[in-house]
Amino acid sequence: DAHKSEVAHRFKDLGEENFKALVLIAFAQYLQQCPFEDHVKLVNEVTEFAKTCVADESAENCDKSLHTLFGDKLCTVATLRETYGEMADCCAKQEPERNECFLQHKDDNPNLPRLVRPEVDVMCTAFHDNEETFLKKYLYEIARRHPYFYAPELLFFAKRYKAAFTECCQAADKAACLLPKLDELRDEGKASSAKQRLKCASLQKFGERAFKAWAVARLSQRFPKAEFAEVSKLVTDLTKVHTECCHGDLLECADDRADLAKYICENQDSISSKLKECCEKPLLEKSHCIAEVENDEMPADLPSLAADFVESKDVCKNYAEAKDVFLGMFLYEYARRHPDYSVVLLLRLAKTYETTLEKCCAAADPHECYAKVFDEFKPLVEEPQNLIKQNCELFEQLGEYKFQNALLVRYTKKVPQVSTPTLVEVSRNLGKVGSKCCKHPEAKRMPCAEDYLSVVLNQLCVLHEKTPVSDRVTKCCTESLVNRRPCFSALEVDETYVPKEFNAETFTFHADICTLSEKERQIKKQTALVELVKHKPKATKEQLKAVMDDFAAFVEKCCKADDKETCFAEEGKKLVAASQAALGL
């Protein structure tokens, strides 16, 4: 439905607070280096303008698109050229090219300082002194570090952030109350950001069809009692929501997401029996709850798939009449029967089925040709099953830290050109699959593990895309979205890699390591491990283990020493020499 003024329409639908928060998120995701105060000023100017349009939709400039209005506002920033370099060239373009240009300059790894958490009393004072500024700063800091964060979901995080401070700043033990809540929000936030980044990559790199296929599979698993037409409607609406958010259209995205939650709750009887609790919650909680809702029970007595998709004489006729609809129905029927499969596996099966039909429907005897198509699925199903079984056994044997180390070595040998911080971050996250998924029964392991790995490998892909250094990474990331994990799994040691020159400075440690948290200390040790493998890619597991054990003992010894710094200097030299000898460096 057309509106005379789009900005007035969204302001009226969303209300001032949601409008201001979403505009702040949008601006911070585009101009990631701009100071907080500058963004607040821009947001206030846009908000005041929106109010004039609400009062009179025919007022000057009120008929302009949101991209035009927001882009014009961003292009007023005085320091655009010196802060962002070539991004300033976007401002010479017209819409829609200007917005596309801004999107291309979003930085997944912006050069921003790590967020350091102040003392609890300091945070509580800041919260009480100016709650509005405190919460806006949270939105700003998260948005600029995570330029694809799902905006309406960030409002949900901010609401929980506010609730945590409201409750805990009045508590007897503020820290005991607040810190676990902030840790939980941080961890959930990182996971949410990474999941959304995959959705945006799917849309932007592989197109709407790829995203819709993913959505059909996932929603069919989640809502197996829903009819295909209902699932298709939800997929269409969900695709619109994510296309908007990934495209920077945050006001439309938030409005449409709320409409979708409303529709789902009004039609829950024909969608899922699991939605009742979600639908009793306020909007942000409701939308989040629906997105995370458990799979409904499968309908009883579902007929065999073979009848419609293999045995029927009309397979090629049905396929030819509407290829994507027929493949969509195949995916829907397969997914609703298999909550035990990962979405990416279901998509591989659908791709195999499509390839078979393309070949067989042009053959002399199509039915004879595609009669055994389901047999082709067996190895595709067994491959992730076996991989998960092996890795869960290894995880249970080693524990999370050592499992991460095994993956660090494995992935450094596969793609040693990738930067050490990226290898550490990605391998640590890959290693978390163990504690996240191996505890689940067999029926839940694959969807948990392989779909999580898709999210983590996408982090590697987007970080590598910024500064490409490995043809093998580029190949695995760009050839097929659903085969990324099998592609990386299949990589062997890179025999073309020339080992890195030994640099003693890389392996020089100081007393500051003693005051780090356990997590930070692990990262230091894992960074050293990656560097070690880059120097000696042919080192055996046993050699690496011996060096790492010596390193752990060295850190422990020097952290107990009276003169820590002297210990690190003297014992460090000995450790480096011993390690060089052990590895033949």
């Epitope: 639908d13 949601n18 409005d255 909007l283």
Partner: nanobody, 128 residues
């Protein structure tokens, strides 16, 4: 034109209760949220409470949480504000607002600019 009419104001002693009513009639377009604001002499109009029809969600200003309760009848486009444990600082003209946003605010704060139609107001005086 949407008409918004409040009733139920009056004089009450501290600790007492009052129930305000508000009916919106005429065109009901965009009556997604209805709410209450108040304005004490020499002060800005401030948010009190609101109800969003789309989810039946209610939200309140911190100063009235636990004492005031907003409820509504969507079919009649009517909202009520039950005010308990009234304090002298609750003294103000109470305004009903209609044609609010479709969705509740993430931080529970509404603004006069969010609403398209207003009543004339009803006086509430709490004596000590």
């Amino acid at each position: 034109e949407l008409q918004v009419v409040e009733s139920g104001g009056g004089l009450v002693q501290a600790g007492g209760s009052l129930r305000l009513s508000c009916a919106a009639s005429g065109r009901t377009f965009r009556s997604n949220t209805m709410g209450w604001f108040r304005q004490a002499p020499g002060k800005e109009r401030e948010f009190v409470a609101a109800i969003t029809w789309s989810g039946g969600t209610t939200y309140y200003a911190d100063s009235v949480k636990g004492r005031f309760a907003i409820s509504g009848d969507n079919a009649k486009n009517t909202v009520y504000l039950q005010m308990n444990s009234l304090k002298p600082e609750d003294t103000a003209v109470y305004y009903c607002a209609a044609e609010g946003p479709k969705w509740e605010p993430w931080n529970g704060i509404a603004h006069p600019a969010d609403f398209g139609s207003w009543g004339q107001g009803t006086q509430v005086t709490v004596s000590s």
